[in-house]
Amino acid sequence: AQPFAHLTINATNIPTGSHKVSLSSWYHDRGWAKISNMTFSNGKLIVNQDGFYYLYANICFRHHETSGDLATEYLQLMVYVTKTSIKIPSSHTLMKGGSTKYWSGNSEFHFYSINVGGFFKLRSGEEISVEVSNPSLLDPDQDATYFGAFKVRDID
Amino acid sequence: AQPFAHLTINATNIPTGSHKVSLSSWYHDRGWAKISNMTFSNGKLIVNQDGFYYLYANICFRHHETSGDLATEYLQLMVYVTKTSIKIPSSHTLMKGGSTKYWSGNSEFHFYSINVGGFFKLRSGEEISVEVSNPSLLDPDQDATYFGAFKVRDID
Amino acid sequence: AQPFAHLTINATNIPTGSHKVSLSSWYHDRGWAKISNMTFSNGKLIVNQDGFYYLYANICFRHHETSGDLATEYLQLMVYVTKTSIKIPSSHTLMKGGSTKYWSGNSEFHFYSINVGGFFKLRSGEEISVEVSNPSLLDPDQDATYFGAFKVRDID
């Protein structure tokens, strides 16, 4: 059967800081999260079946004044979907998206979402991971911050 | 045959107001809009065939000064794609996206688009609907504001 | 076999200017770029096989102060995915997205990405192209600026 995964953020273990970090805690079997014929391990989505896959990610950032003051009002809110090949140890960014934002104190609430998607050839054993900037600003809802993949066709 | 739908906004019936509302008027059979083996009824996209579907939405907001004065320059421009189960009356948000925006009077024109997409298990009889904030700012073009779904695979 | 394409920006030939232009230089056979059972010619992605396709585009814009001063700080950063029919010479926009932006000199770096996607009926011979505003601001990375398509199902 055609492999797929839809992984939602596990908010109990989101890193702090503003630098780019790899998000390693995702749900794969609760709520909207699900996986079939792929593996989730060590924060990475592992391909078990060669093929062409559509990959996607939706990342939401938010800040409310009750959470405290931002260290800077000028933010780079970014997502990077990367592929790592174990056989040839290397990591490459497949897709990136995001925006620079000025989240001023003039408003008590700020929100921003990124969506990326694309069609890629994946080989068994390759790993997909998601990196973001400013992870402490991530929206922890399952409808907000997630990524996934589904196989569309075989490699000829 | 595999079900699909691509529904485009029917701008003749867009609600006013700034609060979150469900958009119930969509075209399903003109221009780019089309549907097959799914049903559009009462503003909802009804699933007729169990399966895993890729769902997506593209929502564009715009304002030109000739349209009048905004009540606030600080806007939350949001979309929520929801699933309603009739058997167990409940509604859940599958995907959300958007941004807070400061649309100042210093510029005569403002525009912003949101795109969300994800892979979900849908059962026959379940309904997909789209909610937005500030519906009076929606771009009424068929290439701007739409949502859709296509079945990727059966449920094992 | 099911047709697909994933085309990445060829940054050696990006137009200048701020007006809307068609992007004609894309890679189809290096890095993440690939094509099968479709044709890339004269800057357009040509459909060789009737069907319903999922189309997508990811467009990133960026500016660093070291690149020089912007002619205006008020920008419309937009993408339009268009379909051209040769038999009936006409061009229509399938999808659009983007945002107006205020990229002030208060920040040395600015970034913004757009993602659009949708499900469309395409006939053999039809051509897909991508237009953007402010092409000189495009991010030339293959993970940043790309578009693609994959066939999901036949036309009944």
Partner: nanobody, 127 residues
Framework: EVQLVESGGGLVQAGGSLRLSCAAS????????MGWFRQAPGKEREFVGF????????YYGESVKGRFTISRDNAQNPVYLQMNSLKPEDTAVYYC????????????????????WGQGTQVTVSS
């Protein structure tokens, strides 16, 4: 649960001043357009004033023009109603509401255009 809370009312002599405030809790309304209304016993709710989210535009009811001023802090809550040169006919319960439209319409002075009313604050002006 969304709540608006009005405060600052009281008893004041004619010619005096009061400053009312309207604070929102439960959801982000800090930058919504807001309206002040009042209701005297046995009378309909009457429009007092309106302020946009940025504070850049204000409108007033005819009976309070030149005496009342609506303002808001540069950033967040609350929205204020500064009432000067008070008259006995200003006696009423004062309410604030969140304007429900994206655009300012000609009906901004109608109470039906507002949501999330608070409990009100009593203002009594003695002669």
């Amino acid at each position: 649960e969304v709540q608006l809370v009005e405060s600052g009312g009281g008893l004041v002599q004619a010619g005096g001043s009061l400053r009312l405030s309207c604070a929102a809790s439960g959801r982000t309304f800090s930058r919504s357009a807001m309206g002040w209304f009042r209701q005297a016993p046995g009378k309909e709710r009457e429009f007092v004033g309106f302020i946009t989210g940025s504070g850049g535009t204000t409108y007033y009811g005819e009976s309070v023009k030149g005496r009342f001023t609506i303002s808001r802090d540069n950033a967040q809550n609350p929205v204020y109603l500064q009432m000067n040169s008070l008259k006995p006919e200003d006696t009423a319960v004062y309410y604030c509401g969140v304007y429900r439209r994206t655009y300012i319409s000609s009906t901004y002075s109608e109470s039906s255009e507002y949501d999330y009313w608070g409990q009100g604050t009593q203002v009594t002006v003695s002669s």
